[in-house]
Amino acid sequence: LQCYNCPNPTADCKTAVNCSSDFDACLITKAGLQVYNKCWKFEHCNFNDVTTRLRENELTYYCCKKDLCNFNEQLEN
């Protein structure tokens, strides 16, 4: 699985990585002005786990299981 993955929050992450086989999902999250793009585990694609792992109380997130599916426009749909 390929995901956009930037180590630190960035407005427009364009770094694509081949996720390790442990990861079966891509995540994009917006918390305030912070946008996170990550390789993720689908079992953690729920509000509680995303907020806990990102130390953010309010956010919007989108998980998907296709290559490079975690781009900004997904959060606007």
């Epitope: 442990d22 585990k41 792992r53």
Partner: antibody, heavy 121, light 107 residues
Framework: EVQLLESGGGLVQPGGSLRLSCAAS????????MSWVRQAPGKGLEWVSY????????HYPDTVKGRFTISRDNSKNTLYLQMNSLRAEDTAVYYC??????????????WGQGTLVTVSS | DIQMTQSPSSLSASVGDRVTITCRAS??????LAWYQQKPGKAPKLLVY???TLAEGVPSRFSGSGSGTDFTLTISSLQPEDFATYYC?????????FGQGTKLEIK
């Protein structure tokens, strides 16, 4: 304050079994992945197991696969490591560690003080 | 499995020195690299993750850099409490592996 307290170590004969426990406090245990890492006397660090927050996924290196089983009881805030068919090379201090620092998987930000397992006849 | 190789295995330095420790991965791990410090008889302490992000409470004299396969941990001005063993660890995915460690000793 985050605290991880390991117990259950001791002397065991080759081929024997042991169950380690790690009691967690000071954080929402059920929301965090956890790992066990060991360190043989005078040697470096070796990761031995991982379990996701809900227990749905576990991972092991080949050196312990099939012999060690990681589990957790989120109602008791406790992590376990069941070790079977123990070998002399399993002798080490075993640390439990909280996994998942910020948005990262497999980064361990809090560690217990360790429990010593000695495998010897 | 991804192999992590640290160099040097040991290093003597003095208080105030600038010190660099190197870690090399056997394959591309992007920026998925962490550094830990361990003092004798103590548990490891997280210093850096994502190759260059300092963990909470870590002094700014520590810095990490690199991506892909080659990484460094730099201590800009050694303090007495920095004499310890340092380990790198990739966090790209399981199995997790550590470098063999670099023991930093007082000259």
């Amino acid at each position: 304050e985050v605290q991880l307290l390991e117990s259950g170590g001791g002397l065991v004969q080759p081929g024997g079994s042991l169950r380690l426990s790690c009691a967690a406090s000071g954080f929402a245990f059920s929301s965090y992945d956890m790992s066990w890492v060991r360190q043989a006397p005078g040697k470096g660090l070796e990761w031995v197991s991982y379990i996701s927050s809900g227990g749905g996924s576990t991972h092991y290196p080949d050196t312990v696969k099939g012999r060690f089983t990681i589990s957790r009881d989120n109602s008791k805030n406790t992590l376990y490591l069941q070790m079977n068919s123990l070998r002399a090379e399993d002798t080490a201090v075993y640390y439990c560690a909280r996994d998942g620092y910020y948005a990262e998987y497999y980064v361990m930000d809090y560690w217990g003080q360790g429990t010593l397992v000695t495998v010897s006849s | 499995d991804i192999q992590m190789t640290q160099s040097p295995s040991s290093l003597s330095a003095s208080v105030g020195d600038r010190v660099t420790i190197t870690c090399r991965a056997s394959e591309n791990i992007y920026s998925y690299l962490a550094w830990y410090q361990q003092k004798p008889g103590k548990a490891p302490k997280l210093l850096v993750y994502n190759a260059k992000t300092l963990a909470e409470g870590v002094p700014s004299r520590f810095s990490g850099s690199g991506s892909g396969t080659d990484f460094t941990l730099t201590i800009s001005s050694l303090q007495p409490e920095d004499f310890a063993t340092y380990y790198c660890q990739h966090h790209y995915g399981s199995p997790l592996t550590f470098g063999q460690g670099t023991k930093l000793e007082i000259k």
